[in-house]
Interface confidence: low
Amino acid sequence: DSEEDEEHTIITDTELPPLKLMHSFCAFKADDGPCKAIMKRFFFNIFTRQCEEFIYGGCEGNQNRFESLEECKKMCTRDNANRIIKTTLQQEKPDFCFLEEDPGICRGYITRYFYNNQTKQCERFKYGGCLGNMNNFETLEECKNICEDGPNGFQVDNYGTQLNAVNNSLTPQSTKVPSLFEFHGPSWCLTPADRGLCRANENRFYYNSVIGKCRPFKYSGCGGNENNFTSKQECLRACKKGFIQRISKGGLIKTKRKRKKQRVKIAYEEIFVKNM
């Protein structure tokens, strides 16, 4: 199939983190199973976002197990390269910019910034350190970039990309992944699920920071880590709000210019890292 080799230089409306998995089993941990054979197999590691080798015992296990590296890549990667994706244009304003400041329920009293929709500017507030909402930025700069209008009435994204008012050309200033997609929740939400050392099989949930969802896992009853919740709700409450996900909803922005209004489609430029 010649389509297998087609190039994808532009993809519109791509979702930036969390990673969009092709199949749920790609998110499963490598499972060697209870048998004792030593068989070289491959699994997709959601933390490194690569297919990796593991030793399979020969029975049971799960679907995240492939006989070859190629098969693993085909099933679990969106294409045969890792992508660093940068947005070249951003939507008018993310919905969370319109949320009221929310200090949360903790008592950390950290200086943060929020976009005040009344004054149409970013302002400082005291954040308690947990919960709250996504209208919460570590720096004034970040808040301004995401929620305020640019100096000429249009948005500037976190790469400093601007729409040139003269010729509509896109001018990316930087290629770093924006802090917009950093995790602002508790650090343990970023740790992998850990079964622990005992022999129980308790239904628990952990926050999968790569796919941005709470997923079930079996807890052994002791040990493990703090990314371990008795309910999905508890997991989401603790971890989900810390991940600022996608900015683009409809994939269209309006540029505020004196002449006619124009709609510009979001495009994503991809830089391929051939390390798989």
């Epitope: 199939d1 389509e3 791509t14 092709m22 199949h23 749920s24 089993f25 999905k232």
Partner: antibody, heavy 119, light 107 residues
Framework: EVQLVESGGGLVQPGGSLRLSCAAS????????LDWVRQAPGKGLEWVAD????????LYNQKFKGRFTISRDNAKNSAYLQMNSLRAEDTAVYYC????????????WGQGTLVTVSS | DIVMTQSHKFMSTSVGDRVSITCKAS??????VAWYQQKPGQSPRLLIY???TRHTGVPDRFTGCGSGTDYTLTISSVQAEDLALYYC?????????FGGGTKLEMK
């Protein structure tokens, strides 16, 4: 509005072939996998195959692998199911469904196309 | 393959009743269960995914729950338009498999 429209069904003799088409519209085609699911008359649902439009990666129900082939044409926003060596028991309504990775479920379905295998 | 068993092929109910449709998996599917509704002559419609999350536009009288091998779809107050076939499906591993269906009908 998301729409999936199947076509290509009809009457075919045992041992014959048929190619079903699924035309997708109302969303970015490469953002979601597409699946084929079939339903024999008066029976339940049976998953057939899945394709990722970006790289063409496929998953099959082993029961159909070798006889059925799923493919896609991104330029036409379409997915296909090539069915060979058809048998009477392949008689069914064949549905195309959008597989939403975040849900791990099929969130939009076409109206289905009837395939009848009979001599 | 994982077998999804819906033990009741038919369930009789009346408008306003609370009804629970059950589904049992042949092995633990870790809440990777979806529920679909299918009316005569129509294609299936997604109601619930990940065992308990309602799909957009689905009335809140539909709720899903369960873990391990046992899953339930509950309609808290049956409406006339709810009379249909209901299928559970596991998406834990391929081949994705459906239950045989439960037909909800009027008493």
């Amino acid at each position: 509005e998301v729409q999936l429209v199947e076509s290509g069904g009809g009457l075919v003799q045992p041992g014959g072939s048929l190619r079903l088409s699924c035309a997708a519209s109302g969303y970015t085609f490469t953002d979601y996998n597409l699946d084929w699911v079939r339903q024999a008359p008066g029976k339940g649902l049976e998953w057939v195959a899945d394709i990722n439009p970006i790289n063409g990666a496929t998953l099959y129900n082993q029961k159909f692998k070798g006889r059925f082939t799923i493919s896609r044409d991104n330029a036409k926003n379409s997915a296909y199911l090539q069915m060979n060596s058809l048998r009477a028991e392949d008689t069914a309504v064949y549905y195309c469904a959008r597989y939403y990775g975040d849900y791990d479920a099929m969130d939009y379905w076409g109206q289905g196309t009837l395939v009848t295998v009979s001599s | 393959d994982i077998v999804m068993t819906q033990s009741h092929k038919f369930m009789s109910t009346s408008v306003g009743d609370r009804v629970s449709i059950t589904c049992k998996a042949s092995q633990d599917v870790h809440t990777a269960v979806a529920w679909y509704q299918q009316k005569p002559g129509q294609s299936p419609r997604l109601l619930i995914y990940w065992a308990s999350t309602r799909h957009t536009g689905v009335p809140d009288r539909f709720t899903g729950c369960g873990s391990g091998t046992d899953y339930t779809l509950t309609i808290s107050s049956v409406q006339a338009e709810d009379l249909a076939l209901y299928y559970c499906q596991q998406h834990y591993t391929t081949p994705y498999t459906f239950g045989g269906g439960t037909k909800l009908e009027m008493k």
